[in-house]
């Protein structure tokens, strides 16, 4: 029966610099019960905080929500492993909220073969922003990637669409069967998941000629 | 604890490339992006770029485009940095350097003399 | 790319003096998040440089309160209340506001 390994918090995550939640790994148990608690000061602070939340993030986790963020001040966290034998500490970590969003895919994504009289066909993709991203206050730059395959093919073409919402694509098959996806990432953070693929077949006559 | 181990020193010719290691551990090596910095002797620092070990996304200082690739090996905990088409100027002290979830450098490694020489 | 600029170059200091390093930015460094991200490193000869700052005033873990950074906008300043023997190194500023992260040319702080 030994103290406790040390924990590592491994992960800090936020959808949308509102809230955000950080996981721990826990270090070796020493055979005994353990507890776990993840303690926080805020830069400029030196009274220290218990995490408010260790239910929503599900185990091994703190969440902060609404009223315990704040996108103007870096946490300073560590994590606290206490069984009968002694305590074991995880390294310092420093969080600037800013610096850990990772959105919700993009919404709605809509994909349709556009046949023009007078220009060539093309695809033309469309989504919205994460629900819970609010792109008016001017804090949020989201940054969009297209990712398209015909059905059975391995490799995806990637496409970088900027800030657009909207995107066209000229090159494609004709007559095959394209899944189409869509992320998205903030100026600074982590790419989204993709989307759930949407699905087009490309009609036999869809042409790349002039 | 963490610690970032990069080897003291590498000779090089004029012309060629050299490929510099950061070996990471006391840590998640995927959760924290791995940034390189350039020291040439007796002046400031440079900062080269960054990668996120979890895909590989980069982020690049303009300066060093087509001059330094930065990589990594998931299953080693290693970050690389490649040096192509060496000469002087690119004589100097290489560290690899790891934030938190931050923008500053937490934590760095000790350096990898890079001397390009005939 | 910022531009950084650090005064003085060299700094001869009694022990047990006050040293102050200014470094002075060619754009604001407010993000635009809100936050100002000018940081101040220390580099030993043969070793790696080490945080000393974050974001202007905040000393990082295990900094001696003798240190402390203040200044907004462009005009930033490092301070050393009672200057000891460990303290006589090399010291940059550090921009991480825009991309590309710059640094400044450093200030060596050395005995009268």
């Known amino acids: 029966q030994l103290p406790p390994g040390k924990p590592e918090i491994f992960k800090c995550r936020s959808p949308n610099k509102e809230t955000f939640t950080c996981w721990w790994r826990p270090g070796t148990d020493g055979g005994l019960p353990t507890n776990y608690s993840l303690t926080y000061h805020r830069e400029g602070e030196t009274l220290m905080h218990e995490c408010p939340d260790y239910i929503t993030g599900g185990p091994n986790s703190c969440h902060f929500g609404k009223q315990y963020t704040s996108m103007w001040r870096t946490y300073i966290m560590m994590v606290n492993a206490t069984n009968q034998m002694g305590s074991s500490f995880s390294d310092e970590l420093y969080v600037d909220v800013t610096y850990i969003v990772q959105p919700d895919p993009p919404l709605e994504l809509a994909v349709e073969v556009k046949q023009p009289e007078d220009r060539k066909p093309y695809l033309w993709i469309k989504w919205s922003p994460p629900t819970l991203i609010d792109l008016k206050t001017g804090w949020f730059t989201l940054l969009y990637e297209i990712r398209l395959k015909p059905e059975k093919a391995a490799e995806w073409e990637i496409h970088f669409a900027g800030q657009q919402t909207e995107f066209k694509i000229l090159s494609l098959h004709p007559g095959q069967k394209y899944l189409v996806q869509v992320r998205c990432k903030p100026d600074h953070g982590y790419w989204s998941a993709w989307s759930p693929a949407t699905f087009i077949q490309i009609p036999s006559d869809f042409t790349m000629n002039d | 604890q963490v610690q970032l181990q990069q080897p003291g020193a590498e000779l090089v010719r004029p012309g060629t490339s050299v490929k510099l290691s950061c070996k990471a551990s006391g840590y998640t090596f995927t959760s924290f992006w791995m940034h390189w910095v350039k020291q040439r002797p007796g002046q400031g620092l440079e900062w080269i770029g960054v990668i996120d070990p979890s895909d590989s996304h980069t982020n690049y200082n303009q300066k060093f485009k087509g001059k330094a690739t930065l990589t990594v090996n998931t299953s080693s905990s290693t970050a690389y940095m490649h040096l192509s088409s060496l000469t002087s100027e690119d004589s100097a002290v290489y560290y690899c350097?790891?934030?938190?979830?931050?923008?500053?450098?937490?934590?760095w490694g000790q350096g990898t003399l890079v001397t390009v020489s005939a | 790319d910022v531009v950084m600029t650090q005064t003085p170059f060299s700094l001869p200091v009694s022990l047990g003096d006050q040293a102050s390093i200014s470094c002075r930015s060619s754009?604001?460094?407010?993000?635009?998040?809100?936050?100002?991200?000018l940081h101040w490193y220390l580099q030993k000869p043969g070793q790696s440089p080490k945080l000393l700052i974050y974001k202007v005033s905040n000393r990082f873990s295990g900094v001696p309160d003798r240190f402390s950074g203040s200044g907004s906008g462009t005009d930033f300043t490092l301070k050393i209340s009672r200057v000891e023997a460990e303290d006589l190194e090399l010291y940059f500023c550090s921009q991480s506001t825009h991309v590309p992260w710059t640094f400044g040319g450093g200030t060596k702080l050395e005995i009268k």
């Open positions: 754009q604001s460094l407010v993000h635009s998040n809100g936050n100002t991200y």
């Open positions: 350097a790891r934030g938190d979830y931050s923008n500053w450098f937490t934590y």
